[in-house]
């Protein structure tokens, strides 16, 4: 069959399964004169043979683990054995079969983990190897915990990354492991090939002994610190300790205070650096952080609480330089004149701010001293001895001592004796008629002026008039402002009028005095007036119940999940149709009847959160007026981005030949959310075959070092595969390639002959 099994001499690649006895020829090469015979060279391993007539075949089963690719050359020779065509490369790719079982590198592993370690952070790796091809299921290993001993309440405290063999705590393990209760655990771990997905997979097991150690990285008890301390500062107030020596401690002030009066030393001791003032700030909450030598957080921050204890360092203060009260001539004994309310900045409801009131002087003392008394703790002034006469003494001045347990302050009170309130306010009109307004009349508009008069003493509480709407405006849409000089009342719109809920309102006003009426006098119909407010309809747009609607969902919610809803009402009672505007990513749809919002595509926090769209509510029918509100969808992160290289690393090179092993540093990142601590990647070589030449070592959570294991490298480009695991939930892994060139150098730069067109490395190591 020309083309598939026979043809002219040209470069070709053939794939053959290992382990199979030869059953057919590989290819029949055809000779063109002067070629008469063929010759085979290269990695034949005495398995591959070419007959003189060009028949290429193999004579026994292949083994991929011995050689995964046979690089052969075929040449066409003339009658004298001279090459007249070729040699051309013939590549035999040996396809893998699952003929090797996975094997753990150790039959027993030992490790330790601190209680309260972060869930998902690896503390131990088990490692198995399988000689089969890692690019096929045959060599893809799947790790599992078979059993955890002891198992308490059927809860797994440990988990394993089924791809990398990284063992870490579960959330429950992080919360519940306690060395005092159970200091050690044993895990039986299995590894299967075929990615764990086949009944025909091979497996192996190993035992893991885990010691639980105490975690001393704990938040200390809240601290109480007395304000205005006169002791020498700084003063140690508490301490934190990382589990191992060498941590670098720092404090984080989340409140961004202009003055942050705390510090921490490299032992983890926390100090207050200056006296505190409770009246400036009565409590502090800040965080202690432990970092490694590279400045990466070692764990979560600890919350430090400092409460500032009060001392009595503030005297009472008067409400104003002079407090003025009025009392009517005929007021009865015991009547309240008013209450003096002094203040104390010290802590409320403590002895430091508990105030006593005492009258220390009354002037004039006419007709006698002691006309007034003050309630010791409440500060309420009362008439103590007799009714007062304005014509005898129109004004009294009192000096009142206000004291807390340490300080005394004098406050001054002026009491004006005023005419008795025996006249009621009288409206000049009892009915102000009808007033017709459109419902969209502006707030603040004055819509009516009303007037009552009072014959009592002018400019006193007996004649001052206060207007109240006592009926017809339960929504509080209207208000009345009073001119203190003329007692004129101005009726104003305080809230929007609404034809739909109140087309006609029968409003009733009451006019009253701030001073009580004398005994026997009562407000009557003269103190009341009415008017009718008629509101006319204006077609209004629908109204949303909120200006901004907000919802929060995980970025990995299934398509079709309800992620939120909005509501609007039409003032005229028309039906509403909802729609979305600005859904630039095409993630959402809205039920036009209910306002429920659903996802219609995969969401992605990394594309931006919150995702902001506008929701439009439109009247159905009528004039189709619409209004717009915002919908903000906050996307909560899930670990859905594998790690990758933080930048382009093409152009790395070493000068050939290496005089000593070399190394280079690279950085990883991923697009998921890393809150306080930043990423915590782990690094390993991407395939076992690289381990003879390279090693990778973690520097910190984001950086690692790739080092050569020897100096015997060829002068060419090597592509080093690196496996980066983010330790998230679930853990994600990325395999990245670092191209490293070994090249002849001139003055520390890669030398390339003129005309060399490939990318020239630019970074020497």
């Amino acid at each position: 069959q020309e083309g598939k099994f026979s043809g002219p001499l040209k470069p070709m690649t053939f794939s053959i399964y290992e382990g199979q006895e030869p059953s057919q020829i590989i290819f029949q090469f055809k000779a063109n004169p002067p070629a008469v015979t063929f010759e085979l060279t290269g990695e034949t391993d005495n398995i591959f043979v070419i007959e003189r007539e060009g028949l290429l075949y193999y004579n026994r089963a292949l083994d991929r683990e011995t050689r995964s690719t046979h690089n052969l050359q075929v040449a066409a020779l003339d009658a004298n054995g001279i090459i007249v065509e070729g040699p051309v490369p013939i590549t035999i790719k040996v396809k893998d079969i699952n003929d090797n079982r996975p094997t753990f590198l150790q039959s027993k592993y030992e490790g330790s983990v601190r209680q309260n370690s972060r869930p998902g952070k690896p503390f131990l790796y088990v490692n198995a190897t399988d000689l089969d091809d890692p690019a096929t299921p045959n060599g893809q290993l799947y790790y599992q915990i078979v059993i955890q001993l002891p198992m308490i309440n059927n809860v797994m405290y440990f988990q394993i990354n089924n791809k990398t063999g990284a063992i870490s705590l579960t959330r429950e393990g992080s919360q519940e492991l306690n060395p005092a209760k159970n200091p050690s655990y044993n895990l039986v771990i299995s590894v299967k090939d075929m990615g764990g997905q086949s009944e025909n997979s091979f497996s192996d097991t190993t035992s893991v002994d885990i010691i639980v150690t105490e975690n001393i990285w704990k938040a200390p008890k809240p601290v109480e610190m007395v304000e205005n301390s006169t002791d020498p500062h700084p003063i140690k107030i508490t301490q934190v300790r990382w589990n191992d020596p060498g941590a670098q401690y720092s404090l984080v002030d989340k409140e961004k205070l202009p003055r942050f009066p705390f510090s921490i030393d490299q032992e983890g001791d926390i100090y207050v650096t200056q006296p505190l003032d409770r009246e400036e700030k009565d409590a502090y909450v800040f965080y202690a952080v432990a970092k490694d030598e590279y400045g990466k957080p070692l764990s979560y921050p600890l919350e430090i609480h400092v409460k500032v204890k009060d001392i009595n360092d503030n005297p009472p203060t008067c409400p104003s330089p002079v407090t003025v009260f009025e009392v009517q001539e005929n007021e009865r004994l015991g009547n309240s004149i008013g209450t003096l309310t002094a203040h104390d900045r010290d802590e409320e409801n403590t002895a430091n701010s508990f105030l006593n009131y005492r009258i220390v002087e009354q002037t004039p003392k006419l007709p006698m001293d002691g006309l007034f008394l003050i309630q010791t703790y409440a500060g309420m002034l009362q008439l103590a001895k007799q009714s007062l006469k304005k014509q005898d003494t129109p004004q009294y001045n009192l000096t009142i001592e206000v004291s807390d347990k340490d300080f005394k302050t004098l406050c001054f009170v002026q009491i004006n004796v005023i005419d008795i309130n025996d006249q009621i306010p009288i409206f000049e009109k009892s009915d102000y008629g009808n007033l017709t307004l459109a419902e969209d009349t502006n707030i603040g508009s004055t819509i009516l002026t009303i007037q009552a008069t009072d014959a009592d003493e002018p400019f006193t509480g007996s004649s001052k008039i206060l207007y109240h709407i006592i009926k017809g405006d339960s929504e509080g849409r209207l208000g009345v402002d009073t001119d203190p000089h003329t007692n004129t009342g101005y009726v104003i719109i305080k809230k929007p009028l609404d034809f739909e809920t109140a087309a006609v309102s029968n409003i009733v006003f009451k006019a009253e005095n701030p001073e009580p009426l004398v005994f026997g006098v009562k407000y009557n119909a003269s103190s009341f007036a009415k008017f009718t407010l008629i509101v006319t309809d204006v077609n209004e747009a629908p109204q949303f119940s909120q200006h901004v609607f907000q919802a929060k969902v995980s970025e990995d919610v299934a398509i079709g999940t309800k992620v939120g809803n909005v509501t609007a009402k039409d003032p005229e009672g028309l039906d509403i149709s909802y729609s979305l505007r600005g859904d630039t990513r095409g993630w959402l749809k809205i039920d036009h009847v209910t306002g429920e919002i659903f996802s219609v595509a995969p969401l992605d926090r990394e594309a931006g959160s919150p995702y902001r769209v506008q929701v439009v509510a439109t009247e159905v029918g009528g004039s189709s007026l619409s209004s717009v509100s915002e919908f903000h969808l906050i996307l909560m992160d899930v670990n859905d981005n594998p790690p990758r290289l933080a930048k382009d690393y093409t152009g790395l090179f070493f000068c050939h030949p290496l005089s000593a092993p070399g190394s280079l540093i690279f950085e990883a990142t991923d697009d998921d959310q890393h809150l306080f601590r930043g990423p915590h990647f782990t690094f390993s070589l991407g395939s076992g075959s690289l381990q003879n030449d390279w090693e990778v070592s973690k520097i910190n959570g984001t950086h690692a070092r790739l080092s050569t294991r020897h100096t015997e490298f060829e002068e060419r480009e090597y592509v080093v595969l690196i496996r980066i695991n983010d330790g998230g939930r679930p853990p994600l892994e990325g395999i990245v390639s670092l191209p490293v060139t070994f090249c002849s150098c001139v003055e520390g730069s890669c030398f390339r002959p003129a005309g060399h067109q490939t990318g020239i490395p630019t970074v020497g190591m």
């Epitope: 004169p33 002067p34 008469v36 015979t37 010759e39 060279t41 003189r52 050359q73 003339d78 009658a79 004298n80 054995g81 001279i82 090459i83 040699p87």
Partner: antibody, heavy 119, light 112 residues
Framework: QVQLQQSEAELVKPGASVKLSCKAS????????IHWMKQRPEQGLEWIGY????????KVNEKFKGKATLTADTSSSTAYMQLNSLTSEDSAVYFC????????????WGQGTSVTVSS | DIVMTQAAPSVPVTPGESVSISCRSS???????????LYWFLQRPGQSPQLLIY???NLASGVPDRFSGSGSGTAFTLRISRVEAEDVGVYYC?????????FGGGTKLEIK
């Protein structure tokens, strides 16, 4: 047994042509190439070219192009070399030899034909 | 063209002694298949050349094992141990790696 029998000595005038023969026996003539060599008196050997009788493919050394023409007759198992425009420089002994097509060994040689160019 | 050089036009030898004849090529005669494409011939007086060694070190059929060939890609040696009177003649090396095939100038073995 394998034999290569070359034609008798030739005395030719300058400018003339001569055709030398090499008759093979004792093996399959078409399986192996026949090579021709020149040896001048008291001098070394020079390779003129070869012919492969199976497909009549001939290759001649650039130095002898226009001078030597190689042919073969499979029916008589004979290889021929014609030399043209002879000069005194062409006076030499000419050998034919067989090259095996498996080990590529020049294992059997003819006894040689002497060509003398003289007026 | 590949130039083959035999530096010694003649070598005298006493019968029963050993002798080495050398040859150099202007290009390596080693091919990727591992073979080195060099012949050694002996041309006795008044006879056709006779093949002694093929592919640098392989003894041709019927040739006494007193003869042996060795060398690298460009430098070659023919060694005759215990020289006999019948070994007299001119020894040629020849390359057949590529066209045109080329011969060395020859080395004459003479009995002292």
């Amino acid at each position: 047994q394998v034999q290569l029998q070359q034609s008798e000595a030739e005395l030719v005038k300058p400018g003339a042509s001569v055709k030398l023969s090499c008759k093979a026996s004792g093996y399959t003539f078409t399986d192996h190439a026949i090579h021709w060599m020149k040896q001048r008196p008291e001098q070394g050997l020079e390779w003129i070219g070869y012919i492969y009788p199976r497909d009549d493919f001939a290759k001649v050394n650039e130095k002898f192009k226009g001078k030597a023409t190689l042919t073969a007759d499979t029916s008589s198992s004979t290889a021929y070399m014609q030399l043209n425009s002879l000069t005194s420089e062409d006076s030499a002994v000419y050998f034919c030899a067989r090259m095996t097509n498996y080990l590529y060994i020049m294992d059997y040689w003819g006894q040689g034909t002497s060509v003398t160019v003289s007026s | 063209d590949i130039v083959m050089t035999q530096a010694a036009p003649s070598v005298p030898v006493t019968p029963g002694e050993s002798v080495s004849i050398s040859c150099r090529s202007s290009k390596s005669l080693l091919r990727s298949n591992g073979n080195t494409y060099l012949y050694w011939f002996l041309q006795r007086p008044g006879q056709s050349p006779q093949l002694l060694i093929y592919r640098m070190s392989n003894l041709a059929s019927g040739v006494p094992d007193r003869f042996s060939g060795s060398g690298s890609g460009t430098a070659f040696t023919l060694r005759i141990s215990r020289v006999e009177a019948e070994d007299v003649g001119v020894y040629y090396c020849m390359q057949h790696l590529e066209y045109p095939f080329t011969f060395g100038g020859g080395t004459k073995l003479e009995i002292k």
